[in-house]
């Protein structure tokens, strides 16, 4: 019996087609992805093959103005239109709190939404009962398939799930659900979830009875053969894990941003054992036409976005200096504003010992592309912010050793004075440079804001200590020459859309007046 699994993950509100790098589509003939194009390919496969499941491994929420405006209603609407068979909850599904998940998505989705390792307690337990499930058994052709969901247990540090949801260990939570399905004669089981490729592989290895793992969170690109675009494969598709009980378990993920549609064919024997598995992600490029009815619907929903872009988010009473002349040479107040917004967006009081789990921000000055003049009545709009942060990136959470951070700050000024983008703007950090010293030895003082303290204060950076830092995904991926970050990071979790972070902060503050205050000094 053959099953075709079509899968997406980490779509991050790319409802419209995008450019090859998943930013805003500029030249339509070269654009990719989007739900209208995805629908065309899905329908083509559904017509051609008998047993097809369309699955999403989480993080539909967050990433473009679509989410900022529609807050998840767009996810439910278009996933319903594409007739997804199931979705796992990702960490970003909690970005607007539990209510922001329940109302727009859980109550409106016409497909099961899954997670076996999230347990509700207190008053939330009855409110959320039945709105998401640990598993769902689906009839597919003449067989039944069990789909068991899971979500990163780090979600309380990455999003806003509140205090009434407990995120259990994935493997511990999955095993009893799989065991139950097995006793009920469900012998084909897919683990669908959002904990990253390393955990996906562990689930394949450790959870007895799981036949296939369809994952997300780490934006992993797997491919067999010559890859069709710029993404470099982390391994073959499917990635085969040998389980502790000796089975070959295929593990898949489909990069991110709706650029690819994962396509996996699995052959099962009559006892539900996987005999063979093969496939590849399908690049959703312009050779695949956009479905006209879905496209028309997208255009209808788009109207509200254009109106939103010009509405006032808040006011500034000072000039927001985002000029290259400032931000690539010295501390600039636009850099301070953005870093303060990044930290504010990551306030998560999850432990009595810590005032917050993260206090530091770094931001490449070259990523700040425009100032905002206060003389336009002080008004700040989404459109203004899109000029400052035009690349559609995310502000991510990483864990780095102090020694890596020191290298990053040395890199920040290794060729100072040439208006290059690697000069770092900061938050929760005090750095002093001596440019008279040779490159690689110019950081003379580097103090960082404590987190395990009731009164935050600046302490010298410790080389062997592990620190959490918020930074643009561009830096996490080694951009602007920050190879040491990419090579030495200990953990990387994708965060919220950059503009969304700053716009939310400005809306919250209402009036802003960021200053240059001595975060970066030269001796």
């Amino acid at each position: 019996w053959e099953l075709t699994i079509l899968h997406t993950n980490d779509v991050h509100s790319r409802l419209e087609q995008t450019s090859e790098d998943s930013s805003k589509c500029v030249n339509a003939s070269r654009c990719m992805g989007g739900v209208a194009r995805l629908f065309t390919k899905v329908q083509q496969i559904r017509r051609a093959e008998p047993n097809v499941l369309l699955l999403d491994a989480g993080d539909q929420y967050q990433g473009t103005i679509w989410f900022t405006v529609y807050k998840g209603a767009e996810v439910a609407h278009f996933m319903n239109a594409l007739r997804y068979d199931a979705m796992a909850l990702g960490n970003h599904e909690f970005d607007n709190g539990v209510e922001g998940l329940i109302e727009p998505l859980l109550k409106e989705a016409k497909f099961p939404i899954l997670s076996a390792n999230i347990k509700a307690k207190g008053p939330l337990a009855s409110q959320i009962s039945g709105l998401y499930l640990p598993y769902k058994v689906l009839p597919v052709g003449d067989e039944v398939v069990g789909i068991v969901g899971y979500t990163s247990k780090e979600t309380p540090f990455l999003s806003n799930p509140g205090t009434n949801l407990v995120f259990e260990d994935e493997i511990t939570a999955l095993q009893p659900e799989v065991d139950k399905l097995k006793t009920l004669n469900v012998n084909k089981i897919i683990a669908l979830g959002h904990s990253g490729f390393e955990m996906d592989k562990l689930i394949a290895q450790k959870v007895r009875g799981v036949d296939v793992v369809v994952g997300g969170h780490s934006n992993t690109f797997l491919y067999t053969g010559n890859p069709p675009s710029k993404e470099v494969p982390a391994g073959k598709y499917p990635f085969i894990v040998t389980s502790d009980d000796g089975r070959k378990v295929p593990v898949v993920q489909a990069y991110a941003f709706g650029k690819y549609l994962g396509y996996l064919k699995i052959e099962f024997d009559e006892r539900g054992n996987v005999i063979s598995s093969h496939g590849n992600p399908i690049l959703l490029n312009s050779s695949i036409p956009e479905d006209p009815s879905i496209k028309a619907d997208i255009n209808k929903w788009r109207i509200k976005l254009d109106n939103y872009s010009t509405q006032e988010l808040g006011k500034t009473i000072v000039y927001l200096d985002g000029s290259s002349q400032s931000c690539r040479f010295r501390e600039c107040n636009m850099g301070n504003l953005i870093c303060d917004a990044m930290i504010n967006n990551n306030l998560r009081h999850t432990d009595e010992m810590f005032w917050n789990h993260v206090s530091m921000c770094i931001l490449n000055g070259g990523g700040i592309r425009s100032p905002i003049d206060e003389r336009n009545n002080g008004t700040i709009t989404w459109e203004n912010l899109a000029a400052v942060l035009p690349f559609g990136g995310t502000f991510d959470l990483v864990q780095l050793k102090g020694s890596t951070l020191k290298k990053a700050f040395e890199h920040s000024v290794h060729r100072y004075g040439q208006s290059t983008g690697e000069f770092l703007q900061v938050g929760g950090i005090h750095v002093v440079y001596d440019l008279s010293r040779k490159p690689g030895d110019r950081v003379v003082k580097l103090d960082v804001l404590c987190t395990k303290c009731r009164v935050p204060s600046y302490d010298p950076l410790k080389m062997d200590e592990v620190y959490k830092v918020i930074l643009p995904n561009f830096l996490a991926n080694g951009g602007d020459g920050f190879q040491m970050i990419k090579d030495e990071l200990l953990r990387h979790d994708s965060g919220d859309q950059d503009i969304n972070v700053v716009s939310t902060y400005i809306s919250k503050m209402k009036v802003i007046y960021p200053a240059v205050e001595g975060r970066i000094k030269f001796s």
Partner: antibody, heavy 118, light 107 residues
Amino acid sequence: QVQMKQSGPELVKPGASVKIPCKASGYTFTDCNMDWVKQSHGESLEWIGDINPNNGGTIYNQKFKGKVTLTIDKSSSTAYMELRSLTSEDTAVYYCARTNWDYAMDYWGQGTSVTVSS
Amino acid sequence: DIQMTQSPSSMYASLGERVTITCKASQDINSQLSWFQQKPGKSPKTLIYRANRLIDGVPSRFSGSGSGQDYSLTISSLEYEDMGIYYCLQYDVFPRTFGGGTKLELK
């Protein structure tokens, strides 16, 4: 509005077969699976099976395997249930019921009474 | 197969009264539970699915609750047209299984 229209009562002889139609209207036929349910006189309900109108895929209650065949005709938006080798035990009302996105039955046909008697 | 035990098997109630019918599954059914109402000589009518979601057009006096193995259907204020037999169904796994029914009659 969503409707499932079934045929009138059937009186059939033991050992014979009967094929009951269920014509769907008011929605896209291929969007929803169709379940079939048996109700013997004065008794509770028994789930017979489920059919996917897209590909004809079927899931049967083990108890009815060999007794029942579920089929569909997409062109007429009609689901069929064939009962064969009929005995008095098969005398009952048979219902078709559409299932929603959650695979829960939502709209029911009016039922077809099958009486097996010589 | 999962067994569904409904209680009571029959009951009498007055108009305006609050009525609760329960259904217990032989194991956790993951909120995959429906409630149906059947009147004599008629086909069943679906009231609720996924334990607590009301089908369009069903009066709001009907509500469902429960999780795990235990579920209930409540009619907040009984009306004459609510008389009939009520059935629960688990659709968590195959085969789907129904409860034995609860006959609701006027006191």
